[in-house]
């Protein structure tokens, strides 16, 4: 067998990780990065992270934004760093909601 490392699977990307699922980590590695915004009990909840394997993000990334949730996905190292997902009613805030970054 060859001495070099094989190249078998797609490249994994380094992603910014922000939110409860990140634990103490500020980054994660996966086949796709994401930035999401959802409304939870009147709060705007922002999260960032990665989908480790393609299937995890397959449906989520293709789902168009709704009044309650928006997800933007990308492929590239740290590609979600400057992405902020936005709900479809761009520029308008929902009554009784406030921004909240889930750390």
């Amino acid at each position: 067998m060859e001495d070099e490392k094989p190249k078998v699977n797609p490249k994994l990307y380094m992603c910014v990780c922000e939110g409860l699922s990140c634990g103490n980590e500020d980054h994660c590695e996966g086949q796709q990065c994401f930035s999401s915004l959802s409304i939870n009990d009147g709060f705007h909840v922002y999260q960032k992270g990665c989908f480790q394997v393609y299937e995890q993000g397959k449906m989520t990334c293709k789902t168009p934004p709704s009044p309650g949730q928006a997800v933007e996905c990308c492929q590239g190292d740290w590609c979600n760093r400057n992405i902020t997902a936005q709900l479809p009613t761009k520029g308008k805030s929902f009554p009784g909601t406030q921004n909240f970054h889930l750390e």
């Epitope: 190249k7 078998v8 699977n9 797609p10 994994l12 086949q31 394997v53 393609y54 299937e55």
Partner: antibody, heavy 122, light 106 residues
Framework: QVHLVESGGGVVQPGRSLRLSCAAS????????IHWVRQVPGKGLEWVAV????????YYGDSVKGRFTISRDNSKNTLYLQMNSLRPEDTAIYYC???????????????WGQGTLVTVSS | EIVMTQSPATLSVSTGERATLSCRAS??????LAWYQQKPGQAPRLLIY???TRASGIPARFWGSGSGTEFTLTISSLQSEDFAVFYC????????FGQGTKVEIK
Amino acid sequence: QVHLVESGGGVVQPGRSLRLSCAASGFTFSNYGIHWVRQVPGKGLEWVAVISYDGNNKYYGDSVKGRFTISRDNSKNTLYLQMNSLRPEDTAIYYCAKDRGLDTAGDYFDYWGQGTLVTVSS
Amino acid sequence: EIVMTQSPATLSVSTGERATLSCRASQNISSKLAWYQQKPGQAPRLLIYGASTRASGIPARFWGSGSGTEFTLTISSLQSEDFAVFYCLQYNNWWTFGQGTKVEIK
């Protein structure tokens, strides 16, 4: 649900050829490396070959290098193993196995097919 | 090539007892080790990956430990369905299996 189904096994004479197929479903086939692993009945497991997710990179175990060719058709979700110059010691159950995919250089095998038996005998 | 050595070759255990299987790598493989269970006429089934993480649906009585070159699979209380052949796989540098340990009913 991940499903891998091998086919194409059978009895073949030494020196002849055989092509195995592995039909995959339940996952995004084109995003994962896929392996062939074989097992002489009643004996241990031996890694045979792997092909990268895009089919561009192929790697083989020393015992089959130069005789076996691994390939894939991502449009058909199917993996192949072309086995030439077969020898009696190639007699084995051949399994296809999905790579977990969380390491560019290859990972462990998280799903296996049920195997297809190849018997090389005169 | 990394050589994986499993011991013992055969382990005779009574139902309800603990079984301890060993796998040794010829060089450091970090934690890149998986354990598989294979029953007669079936394909191998993933039990443990990353040396110590149980795969989905695997009962808590199976647990793996070790890193570097020495690894252990422990079955805390053997059930009748656990009797099988167990293989370790290193995936740190290409892929090589141990020769297997058969766990049989005492």
